[in-house]
């Protein structure tokens, strides 16, 4: 065991290359200089190291950087990132979006590991808010990212970042999350004209209050039933029959098919039968 701690003659690594895949674990430990490894991290991913060999390389980096790796090393970790623990990652200070992208790419197509979750949290906290470029990147890799956040976390999303949000990114959001996101979207899109504004705001309307729905009803938006069914019940209830008719336009006929479902069911029960009869749909209050 003792002689294994010394690097055999002629085996000292002068660069990180394919010859190292034939090194035993103890030889890697003894013959690869940690500083050399750190400067040539970008080469590691091109070499088919075994998991056991990667463990050794990680150990060497841990010894060299006990306080956490510098970003120059982190950016080139590649598959070695999969060996990191959340505890390792909490020591890092990742500020570059390129570094974040590089590490997310390693995990692409997989469920989010605790390591990736920790990395993202560290990155976002370091930036102080979910800026547009970060959000763009995160939702590209993880479409459900926004809807996995708490309302408080969502409150750190600036309105300007809302431009990065695609309709599918909101598919799994709950009502409270939409309550937080809607005012931000309203602010972000406020300078758009009527029809363009509606296209952008539509996905967020599950958080819209009654007064905004009343305003939309004056703009000939022709809201489809799928969007209407996602509106807050408490926001829909005060709307008059005339306002709902204007809001839905030609889609108003779809109310009949949804008359047993919320929010349509509850809205119908709040209306005068005479008013409902003006729609000619046979709705019974």
């Amino acid at each position: 065991e003792v002689e294994k701690t010394a690097c055999p003659s002629g085996k000292k690594a002068r660069e990180i290359d394919e010859s190292l895949i034939f090194y035993k674990k103890w030889e890697l430990e003894a013959c690869v200089d940690a500083a050399l490894l750190a400067t040539q991290m970008d080469r590691v991913n091109a070499i088919p190291f075994t998991y056991e060999q990667l463990d050794v390389l990680k150990h060497k980096l841990d010894e060299l950087y006990p306080q956490g790796y510098p970003e120059s090393v982190i950016q080139h970790l590649g598959y070695l990132f999969l060996k990191m623990s959340p505890e390792d990652i909490r020591k890092w200070n990742v500020t570059s979006l390129e570094t974040l992208k590089a590490l997310l790419e390693v995990n692409k197509g997989h469920e989010m590991s605790p390591q990736v979750a920790t990395l993202i949290d560290r990155f976002v906290k370091g930036r102080g808010q979910l800026d547009k470029d970060t959000l763009d990147t995160l939702t590209a890799f993880y479409p459900g990212y926004l809807c996995s956040l708490s309302p408080e976390e969502l409150s750190s999303v600036p309105p300007s970042s809302i431009w990065a949000v695609r309709p599918q990114d909101l598919d799994t959001c709950d009502p409270r999350q939409l309550d937080v996101l809607y005012p931000k979207a309203r602010l972000a899109f406020q300078n758009m004209n009527g029809s363009e504004y509606f296209v952008k705001i539509q996905s967020f309307l599950g958080g819209a209050p009654t007064e905004d729905l009343k305003a939309l009803s004056q703009q000939n938006v022709s809201m489809d039933l799928a969007t209407f069914m996602k509106l807050r019940t408490d926001a829909v209830l005060p709307l008059t029959v005339a306002e709902v008719q204007k809001l839905l336009g030609p889609h108003v006929e779809g109310l009949k098919a949804e008359e047993r479902h919320r929010p349509v069911r509850d809205w119908i029960l709040r209306q005068r039968q005479d008013d409902l009869d003006t729609l000619g749909l046979g709705l019974q209050g």
Partner: nanobody
Framework: QVHLVESGGGSVQVGGSLRLSCAAS????????MSWYRQAPGTEREFVSS???????SYADSVKGRFTTSRDSAKNTVFLQMNSLKPSDTAMYYC?????????WGQGTQVTVSS
């Protein structure tokens, strides 16, 4: 493979209580928003409550003050404590995990409240 398994449903009298559990396996649920939804016959699935990864919660107006959600991250389990049950709470209750990569649903557990 990710699985959500609900349990704890059953029949109860008006004013009674039930505690639903949802056990998540195959991934780390602490990364996800864990929610409860319910669906009564002939109606759409509706939101009941959420437990967020920072420990906060939110509730539908119809259950506020009666239902409480909590989670045990160590056991990858989320709970729904339902008190002062009403006939209108009768439904199939579904557990939902809204994770960054996708959302998952359980098979549901039936809750019946009779007067």
């Amino acid at each position: 493979q990710v699985h959500l398994v609900e349990s704890g449903g059953g029949s109860v009298q008006v004013g009674g209580s039930l505690r639903l559990s949802c056990a998540a396996s195959g991934y780390n649920a602490s990364i996800c928003r864990m929610s409860w939804y319910r669906q009564a016959p002939g109606t759409e699935r509706e939101f009941v409550s959420s437990s967020y990864r920072d420990g906060s919660q939110s509730y539908a107006d119809s259950v506020k003050g009666r239902f409480t959600t909590s989670r045990d991250s160590a056991k990858n389990t989320v709970f729904l404590q339902m008190n002062s049950l009403k006939p209108s709470d009768t439904a199939m209750y579904y557990c939902n995990a809204a994770c960054p990569w996708r959302a998952y649903w359980g098979q549901g557990t039936q809750v019946t409240v009779s007067s």
